[in-house]
Interface confidence: low
């Protein structure tokens, strides 16, 4: 289905001329950013962005690729090199350290330089690196973390934690020897390392003592508290702040976000990670867009500004399962959150960045016809005389042999939300990929986001834009934090 107007060269020339006109008008702002927002699409490589763009368009009965994602509208783009100090292909812990702290670390460590060694507690002390969020708090800004994973997960933990093992969610996950050496679990660090004004996501079970039932699944012991130290970390956090509120469902979140007496808000909506958007109970759990809006309502009260981390964390999980439907619908919700944040903030005083921590071995190919379903089949057959999908994975659990051969696939099968796209190599979980990822930028100092950069550059751009350490002598006008 080719749109008739696209057959005419005038269509393309006019469209390009408009884009060129807009580009010529771009003026780098010489002002500081009062507010910083980093949107992190976990595992959102460029192939994921492209496929999600097409899906977003097709959901609106368009052909697909001509659609704009909210992130596509950001005027400045760079590429980010995602490798960790010890691995070509990184994990979400080492990458979080890079884009949130400005220093590269080792695989599966968080908030530590590469002098720290994975799982070796005694290499922690002295190797801590400080996040931009922590620096923003020191400068008097309000700070928040929003994610669709558990709030103790690798990416959000990069904003507040220092750990040699990203899997140490609660003290039950930390070996006794490491506990004795003084290594703290991530949940404990969430409430004790720094004062975070807004914490929204999953991860209830890591905050409560073993045997504490979960409010949503009280009869499921596996969803209850996991802590061995008997601590109720939510209670401890509430006791720290006069205006603190804890919520665990959507209704309470929406109420709390509009309550002027609430100064600190923790919302934990699932025992572990939040549900995929396609499985979310919209009466109980908020969407990423709703959590982002709630966070912005609270944080934007501070006249000195804010720092906000927003993660679409389950894009990555969908890809690990080789379920592109899940990964792409998560990406669309992530983009919806970016769009809503854009409506609630001004690019005059808010630097917004969108990036990924790493990519996935997810491909989109096979010469499909324009307008054909993103989850559909490529035209024609493969050499084994069977159909194949346009979305595929290099490795992962989608590898299946039936009687020594690759199974055939129909359009109705491949369109199912549960369908696992096929892969070349059988693995229990599909892996990350090592190619560069995009960084989109809008707002004060966004023009600095250009070229091919180390992933660490992202943290430095944010710090410089808001005149945070080590760039307090940033010489930008008006200086950050003078609007009160």
């Amino acid at each position: 289905i080719i749109p008739v107007e696209e057959e005419n060269p005038d269509f393309w020339n006019r469209q390009a001329a408009e884009a060129l006109g807009a580009a010529k008008k771009l003026q780098p702002a010489q002002t500081a950013a009062k507010n910083l927002i980093i949107f992190l699409g976990d595992g959102m490589g460029v192939s994921t962005v492209t496929a999600a763009r097409i899906l977003k368009g097709q959901k609106k009965d368009k052909l697909g690729p001509e659609t704009f994602l909210a992130m596509d509208r950001f005027p400045y783009v760079a590429l980010s090199k995602t490798y960790s100090v010890d691995k070509h292909v990184p994990d979400s812990g080492a990458t979080a350290t890079a884009y949130l702290c400005g220093v590269k670390g080792n695989f599966q460590t968080i908030g530590l330089s590469a002098a720290a060694r994975f799982n070796q507690c005694n290499t922690t002390r002295g190797n801590e690196v400080i996040s931009v969020m922590n620096r923003a708090k020191k400068a008097g800004k309000s700070v928040g973390v929003v994610t669709t994973t558990r709030v103790q997960h690798a990416s959000p933990a990069g904003a507040y934690a220092h750990t040699v093992n990203r899997n140490w969610y609660s003290d039950a996950d930390v070996p006794a020897s490491a506990r004795q050496e003084g290594c703290q679990d991530i949940a404990t660090q969430l409430i004790s390392n720094m004062d975070i004004d807004v914490i929204l996501g999953g991860g209830r079970k890591y905050m409560f003592p073993m045997g504490t039932p979960d409010p949503e699944y009280p009869d499921d012991y596996s969803q209850g508290g996991t802590r061995l130290d008997g601590k109720n970390l939510v209670q401890e956090w509430l006791a720290k702040h006069q205006g603190a509120r804890y919520v665990w469902n959507r209704t309470e979140l929406l109420q709390a976000s509009l309550d002027p007496s609430v100064t600190h808000l923790m919302g934990l909506f699932e025992p572990g990670d939040m549900k995929y958007e396609i499985h979310r109970d919209s009466t109980l759990d908020p969407s990423l867009m709703e959590m982002t809006e709630a966070a912005l309502l609270l944080l934007s009260r501070n006249p000195r500004g804010f720092f906000l981390f927003v993660e679409g964390g389950r894009i990555d999980h969908g890809h690990h399962e080789s379920r592109a439907y899940r990964a792409l619908t998560e990406t669309i919700m992530f983009d919806d959150a970016i769009e809503r944040a854009g409506q609630l903030t001004s690019e005059e005083d808010t630097l917004s960045l969108v990036t990924a921590d790493h990519s996935h071995v997810f491909s989109f190919g096979g010469y499909p016809l324009r307008g054909s379903s993103i989850f559909g089949l490529a035209p024609g057959k493969a050499r084994d005389r069977k159909a194949y999908t346009v979305l595929l994975y290099g490795n992962g659990p989608g590898y299946v042999l039936k009687d020594g051969a690759r199974p055939d696939v129909t359009e109705s099968e491949s369109g199912s939300p549960e369908y696992r796209q096929q892969s070349a190599v059988p693995l229990d979980g599909e892996t990350h990929a090592g190619e560069d990822v995009a960084v989109f930028a809008r707002g004060p100092q966004a023009h600095l986001v250009h070229g091919v950069q180390e992933q660490t550059f992202i943290a430095h751009v944010m710090a410089f834009a808001a005149c945070l350490e080590p760039y307090t002598a940033c010489d930008l006008a008006p200086r950050a934090g003078t609007t009160d």
Epitope: F208, G211, T212, P215, P218, Q235, W248, N249
Partner: nanobody, 126 residues
Framework: QVQLVESGGGLVQAGASLTLSCAAS????????IVWFRQAPGKEREAVSC????????YYGDSVQGRFSSSTDNAKNTVSLQMNSLKPEDTAVYTC???????????????????WGEGTMVTVSS
């Protein structure tokens, strides 16, 4: 702001009755269970009763079973604890609390409570 405020405490004779009230503001009972605790001087805190609007159920501690009953007034967002046949050993500070669990699961564990009231004193003389 979330608040739980108890009222109705006082001095009564053994065998008498007393009704305590717990008024909640800032949240509704729909997503919580309300638990009454008591603490006698020099003794451990003890869970007395739990009422869950969601589950439509009430639970009582062994020492008060058959003598105490809990009820809710949804319109006023209050929970009452009707205490009959009071004994001197019922003398304590009675505190209401809101649990994380909406259906009273694990209701006797203090760590499961999200919000607490200040408490009201009940003295039963012989």
């Amino acid at each position: 702001q979330v608040q739980l405020v108890e009222s109705g405490g006082g001095l009564v004779q053994a065998g008498a009755s007393l009704t305590l009230s717990c008024a909640a503001s800032g949240f509704t009972f729909n997503t919580r269970s309300i638990v009454w605790f008591r603490q006698a001087p020099g003794k451990e805190r003890e869970a007395v009763s739990c009422i869950s609007k969601v589950a439509g159920s009430t639970y009582y501690g062994d020492s008060v079973q058959g003598r105490f009953s809990s009820s809710t007034d949804n319109a006023k967002n209050t929970v009452s604890l009707q205490m009959n046949s009071l004994k001197p050993e019922d003398t304590a500070v009675y505190t209401c609390a809101a649990s994380f669990a909406p259906n009273c699961y694990g209701w006797s564990v203090a760590a499961n409570m999200e919000y607490w009231g200040e408490g009201t004193m009940v003295t039963v003389s012989s």
